[in-house]
């Protein structure tokens, strides 16, 4: 990626890392307002299976692994990208490596959920405080989960689906920070590992994933009031290990793997019309990206 200064634009969809033949170090940003892509500063170490989030206008890349011809190393790294300087800097590492991690942000703190280290599938969860550059373990999930989808709604952290080392999961659970405890919620209608999970209009959406046999294009959403999952329109492409984010009231899904191909497709969901549309293509196909949107 380019090492020049990034343009000072308002809200961009950032995609970091991913996998195509090997783990990638790309950082690219899509501007939905004009359909352009920016090539930004590479990650210092290639990684796939990472997660992305934004805190205080800074982009964080969390966990993953570097799968390269020279070897395969799971990552405990936390790296911070400053859009104003177009530079990455390392932060304190997590207590354990976490590939295929999920992350969520509550009150400016990053929660790192599940993931794997070698064949170990974590149920552990840790919280990062950016102002102190420190990680601390919190209560573990009730279930081991890698390829877990994580979302935050009403200051509660939801962990959805994934793989426990034996089975792909349709179960989901919710973390209550004040009580430091997890509780199971209603299971999804569909087993999903490697799904894209996000929050839009007071609902948790779970898009795509892998059910242990096939990649999925189905999408369902959880209404916290009724505690039910309901299907919405399916995506155009089946995909697992996809990236997902919300931008101006619409869901964007990026890349993934369809069982044959590493997708470059980016689709956008409009909840008003319950439709998906192809909006752009990434510069190359990839799975296992970390995605986040800059704050206003």
């Amino acid at each position: 990626g380019s090492m020049g200064h990034a343009p000072k634009v308002g809200r961009l969809i950032y995609t970091a890392g991913g996998y195509f033949r090997q783990s990638l170090s790309y950082l690219e940003a899509y501007n939905p307002s004009d359909g352009t892509w920016l090539d930004l500063a590479d990650l210092q170490v290639p990684r796939s299976g990472l997660a992305g989030c934004v805190v205080g206008g800074l982009l964080y890349a969390v966990g993953g692994r570097n799968n390269s011809p020279d070897g395969n190393t799971d990552s405990s790294a936390l790296d911070c990208y400053n859009p104003m300087t177009n530079q990455w800097s390392p932060c304190a590492p997590m207590s354990v490596p976490r590939n295929r991690i999920g992350v969520g942000v509550i009150d400016g703190h990053i929660y790192a959920v599940g993931g794997s280290h070698g064949c170990i599938h974590h149920n552990s969860v840790e919280r990062y405080e950016p102002e102190r550059d420190e990680w601390h373990l919190v209560a573990p999930m009730l279930t081991r989960r890698i390829g877990v989808g994580v979302a935050v709604l009403n200051r509660l952290l939801y962990a959805v689906g994934g793989f426990d080392g034996t089975n792909r999961l349709n179960s989901a659970e919710c973390y209550y920070p004040e009580r430091n405890e997890w509780r199971m919620i209603t299971a999804m209608n569909t087993i999903r590992s490697g799904a894209g999970v996000c929050v839009l209009h007071n609902c948790i959406y779970a898009a795509g994933g892998y059910d242990g046999q096939d990649q999925l294009n189905s999408v369902e959403r959880y209404d916290v009031e009724t505690e039910t999952w309901t299907f919405v329109a399916p995506m155009k492409h089946r995909r697992s290990a996809l990236g997902i984010t919300v931008h101006q009231g619409r869901i964007y899904v990026l890349g993934g793997y369809d069982g044959h191909t590493f997708l470059d497709s980016v689709e956008c969901y409009d909840p008003d019309t319950d439709t998906w549309s192809e909006v752009t293509r990434m510069t190359s196909g990839r799975s296992g990206v970390g995605v986040a949107v800059t704050m206003e």
Epitope: R21, S48, C119, I120, G147, G165, S240, F262, S287
Partner: antibody, heavy 124, light 107 residues
Framework: EVQLVESGGGLVQPGGSLRLSCAAS????????IHWVRQAPGKGLEWVAS????????LYAKSVAGRFTISADTSKNTAYLQMNSLRAEDTAVYYC?????????????????WGQGTLVTVSS | DIQMTQSPSSLSASVGDRVTITCRAS??????VAWYQQKPGKAPKLLIY???SLYSGVPSRFSGSRSGTDFTLTISSLQPEDFATYYC?????????FGQGTKVEIK
């Protein structure tokens, strides 16, 4: 019946190429990670490569990285191992195997469905 | 790479004997160890996974245990069909590695 059947082995000259196939029946090859393991004549087992059906990620032993490519076609329920720049030390019986597809915990590493193997001989 | 040092490389035993085969990992592999049986000209068969879990359909005379980085396969009462070569395998970290094998022969 749950089974894997390899094919494509044979005699090839050093520097040559072969493509091995592993056809699954009785279950979906996408149900778990697919591995190739080889065994040189009179020797032990050596893990070669794997592919994750969920992410598409592949892993290779250092001895074959850059020369071998593992892939899968779920529509044909078949996995492949493309072997290029073959060397005498690649001579072996090649087995495909599935990790934990039928009850062995994937985290514990048990490969519980194996093919019968196909012999690859690299010699001039 | 993690080395799995298997011992003995061969042993002679009689039907009814108790047989113990050991694998020592060069570093921690948690419980991510499997054991296989292989007969000449055949593919390996899974016996034990996760160090001590008996795979479905495998006779209960086979058992596995772990003590730190030492892993043991025990055949409590050797049967004629058990004469074969046995391999351990770790899948804790990349790359997965096998022990060199133990050949169990008839005394």
């Amino acid at each position: 019946e749950v089974q894997l059947v390899e094919s494509g082995g044979g005699l090839v000259q050093p520097g040559g190429s072969l493509r091995l196939s592993c056809a699954a029946s009785g279950f979906a090859i996408s149900a778990s990670s697919i591995h190739w393991v080889r065994q040189a004549p009179g020797k032990g087992l050596e893990w070669v490569a794997s592919i994750d059906p969920e992410t598409g990620e592949t892993l290779y032993a250092k001895s074959v990285a850059g020369r071998f490519t593992i892939s899968a076609d779920t529509s044909k329920n078949t996995a492949y191992l493309q072997m290029n720049s073959l060397r005498a030390e690649d001579t072996a019986v090649y087995y495909c195997a599935i990790l934990g597809a039928w009850g062995a915990n994937a985290g514990g590493g048990g490969m519980d469905v194996w093919g019968q193997g196909t012999l690859v001989t690299v010699s001039s | 790479d993690i080395q799995m040092t298997q011992s003995p490389s061969s042993l002679s035993a009689s039907v009814g004997d108790r047989v113990t085969i050991t694998c020592r990992a060069s570093q921690s592999v948690s419980s991510a160890v499997a054991w296989y049986q292989q007969k000449p000209g055949k593919a390996p068969k899974l016996l034990i996974y996760s160090a001590s879990s008996l795979y479905s359909g495998v006779p209960s005379r086979f058992s596995g245990s772990r003590s730190g980085t030492d892993f043991t396969l025990t055949i409590s009462s050797l049967q004629p069909e058990d004469f074969a070569t046995y391999y351990c395998q770790q899948s804790y970290s990349f790359p997965s590695t096998f022990g060199q094998g133990t050949k169990v022969e008839i005394k």
